[in-house]
């Protein structure tokens, strides 16, 4: 999946002038102005050029312009560690004018027994140790401080928390004579939050806990605990929210069942079942109470844990997620897809769509991909004409307005965006797919034929000729 797709921009129209909001009252910290994109979806590039020039005129002496990097801080409490006992940490880029804090949890699968953790340690050590972490990282996508790359929250305080606990951010066990590895994912989050309070988080208005892949599942597992932690520490006014990207997995039946020998081929339920025991994993209290002892693994699956959460969570999930397909033993490697597999893949999209029907804030494009929010071109994909940054902006507004009794969605500002077309890449704004063997970009028609879809069969239920359907797909209608 990684690096396999390029992103393309669609044609855009010129924008009307942007709307501004009233200035803050005297003595209030200056907040980044929320941008209302209602009228400017058409030509984001031109609008962003205006915003950038405005932003730069507002910060003539600011280091913001000069330095895009987040700086590494290893935890002061060195008992909170990565797998190998080295201190965990976080990368931070402060934005002193802002009361928004974005904490991003990195992803990277997991390991669930001594053998596959040993192998992970010897091949992917940066995911188990802080010993070789770079001093700085560049923020990309939702972690970017450039308004054109991150129209949603470019001016927030940005925190990237590297994943070095291999436990889907759930573990609470330290390294000992008995345990070769520490699994402290849940404790790392708590300690990062505690240390950030001394670095300005105490004055936050909103804390958005975001994450991709295993980090996305980590959001679902930890968002309520973070809210509870801040309340207990005397900061009940900080609104805690979650943004879970590519971490909403299904405990479905694998396409081909294989024994649980490694992380990739092990069925997700079995991997998590084994993992929880190995990591001493903790799950949200309200979810845990819904399941018997030994059944806590259920809480790692979004559709089961989500209804138990108190904090608002926005779910971002590709309908045909590559990590989901991997654990389901579906490997698309360039051979045309047989009908049984094609139906399995279509059904996966249908099942996923069904699990999101009661998730009011969701963005689920019908694409074959994995992760989105820290990709530089995360703004490019649209569902029903709305981009993800725009949907997140609408979500912010809906939460801001939620003290009003009305539960109706804001007019022209949707937050429930789930593609309804039934096959991979039926959404023309999907990331471009490359043929895995030739490296060539494939258009939608080539991709669908490669996937074994007969254009006649696809077009018929829509009441279209195959040529008409292809035209529509190519034009993005």
């Amino acid at each position: 999946s990684e690096g396999r797709k390029t992103w393309r921009r669609r044609g855009q129209q010129p924008p009307p002038p942007p709307r501004t909001e009233a200035a803050p009252a005297a003595g209030q910290p200056v907040e980044s102005f929320p941008l209302d994109f209602t009228a400017v979806e058409g030509n984001m590039d031109s609008f962003m050029a205006q915003v950038k020039s405005l932003a730069q005129s507002l910060y003539p002496c600011s280091a913001q312009q000069l330095n895009e990097d987040l700086r590494l801080h290893l935890l002061l409490d060195t008992s909170v560690t990565c797998n190998d006992g080295s201190p965990a940490g976080y990368y931070l880029k402060e934005s002193r004018g802002s009361r928004r804090w974005l904490l991003f949890l990195e992803g990277g699968w997991y390991c669930f027994n001594r053998e596959n953790c040993d192998s992970r340690y010897d091949t992917m050590r940066r995911l188990m140790s802080s010993r070789d972490w770079p001093r700085t990282r560049t923020g990309t996508g939702i972690l970017s401080s450039q308004p054109e790359e991150n129209p949603y929250w470019w001016n927030a305080n940005m925190v990237f928390i590297p994943y070095c606990s291999s436990d889907v951010w759930s573990g609470a066990s330290s390294k000992s004579e008995k345990n070769e590895y520490a699994f402290m994912g849940a404790l790392i989050i708590q300690e990062v939050v505690r240390e950030l309070l001394g670095r300005g988080l105490s004055g936050a208005k909103v804390l958005l806990l975001a994450g991709s892949s295993a980090g996305g599942t980590g959001v679902l597992l930890n968002v309520d605990r973070v809210a509870e932690q801040l309340e207990k520490l005397g900061y009940p006014a900080i609104q805690v929210r979650g943004l879970a990207d590519s971490g909403w997995f299904l405990d479905n039946k694998q396409y081909r069942h294989t024994d649980c020998v490694d992380t990739i081929t092990c069925a997700p339920t079995e991997a998590i079942r084994r993992g929880i025991r190995y990591w001493n994993g903790v799950v949200p209290e309200r979810c845990r109470r819904q399941f018997q002892e030994g059944e806590e693994w259920n809480c790692f699956f979004g559709y089961k844990v989500y209804p138990t959460l108190r904090c608002p969570v926005f779910v971002v999930q590709w309908l045909f997620d590559e990590a989901q397909l991997t654990v389901d033993n579906v490997h698309l490697t360039g051979q045309p897809v047989q009908e049984g597999l094609r139906l399995y893949i279509q059904n996966l999209g249908r099942e996923l769509r069904h699990t999101l029907k009661d998730v009011p804030a969701s963005f689920a494009p019908a694409c074959l991909s994995h992760e989105i929010i820290i990709r530089s071109h995360w703004t490019d994909v649209q569902v029903k004409g709305t981009s993800l940054p725009r949907a997140l902006h609408c979500w912010d507004r809906s939460l801001h307005d939620s003290h009003k009794a009305s539960k109706t969605p804001l007019k022209g500002c949707p937050v429930h965006l789930v593609d309804s077309c039934p096959w991979p890449h039926c959404n023309p704004s999907c990331p471009t797919v490359r043929d895995q063997f030739t490296g060539q970009e494939m258009n939608v028609a080539q991709f669908l034929m490669h996937m074994g879809f007969d254009m006649q069969t696809v077009a018929q239920p829509q009441g279209l000729e195959p040529s008409e359907l292809l035209g529509m797909l190519s034009n993005g209608s």
Partner: antibody, heavy 119, light 111 residues
């Protein structure tokens, strides 16, 4: 200077046993996963076995499972490969290789030791 | 196990021209932003030498005429311009999961 030096090869009869060694120097041996790779005459490379950095996990290719035992002595910076029930198809050059821990690629190879299984 | 299929088995390239070797995996070897495919060069009587790691990173000391690309399950090694000393056998190798495996090799001859 990082170095790996294999020894213990030679001529062995079918059904016999042999213990190969790999002496490491110039790096912290206990920090790295170590592997054996072999190459039959005029053939390609075949991955044989892996020992984790701590020595707690070993993994073998199916072709050698049950006949090979991999071990390491981190205090002596040495990797061992004990081979039993040897067959003619085990005839090969045996290389010991260090796996980088930021990707598992073999960034350092020994010169190899040649094993011939023949009567 | 992940099977690596290398092609062609051999190729002859004129001095100064481009050599392209392909390596296909039976399933994706990419995860968490990295592709776990590596390329080695082996000359007769010598151990293999690392050229490219993680699909596209050039090992230090290796000439810039060697380059690697690809992700997912499809990878390519390019040599351009080919020099006399590049005559050797080239192997791809994956380290995505155990057991590791190698491709069958491509023998490059300089015309």
């Amino acid at each position: 200077d990082v170095q790996l030096l294999e020894s213990g090869g030679g001529l062995v009869q079918p059904g016999g046993s042999r213990k190969l060694s790999c002496a490491a120097s110039g790096f912290t041996f206990s920090d790295f996963g170590m592997h054996w790779v072999r190459q039959a005459p005029e053939k390609g490379l075949e991955w044989v076995a892996y020992s984790s950095s701590g020595g707690t996990t070993v993994y073998y290719a199916d072709t050698v499972k049950g006949r090979l035992t991999l071990s390491r002595d981190n205090s002596k910076n040495t990797l061992f490969l004990e081979m039993t029930s040897l067959r003619s198809e085990d005839t090969a050059m045996y290389y010991c290789a260090r796996a980088s821990y930021d990707g598992g690629y073999f960034d350092c190879w020994g010169q190899g030791t040649s094993l011939t299984v023949s009567s | 196990d992940i099977v690596l299929t290398q092609s062609p088995a051999s190729l002859a390239v004129s001095l100064g021209q481009r050599a392209t070797i392909s390596c296909r995996a039976s399933k994706s070897v990419s995860t968490s932003g990295y592709s776990y495919i590596h390329w080695y060069q082996q000359k007769p009587g010598q151990p293999p030498k690392l050229l490219i790691y993680l699909a596209s990173d050039l090992e230090s000391g290796v000439p810039a005429r060697f380059s690697g690309s690809g992700s997912g399950a499809a990878f390519t090694l390019n040599i351009h311009p080919v020099e006399e000393e590049d005559a050797a056998t080239y192997y791809c190798h994956h380290s995505r999961e155990l057991p590791f495996t190698f491709g069958s090799g491509t023998k490059l001859e300089i015309k």
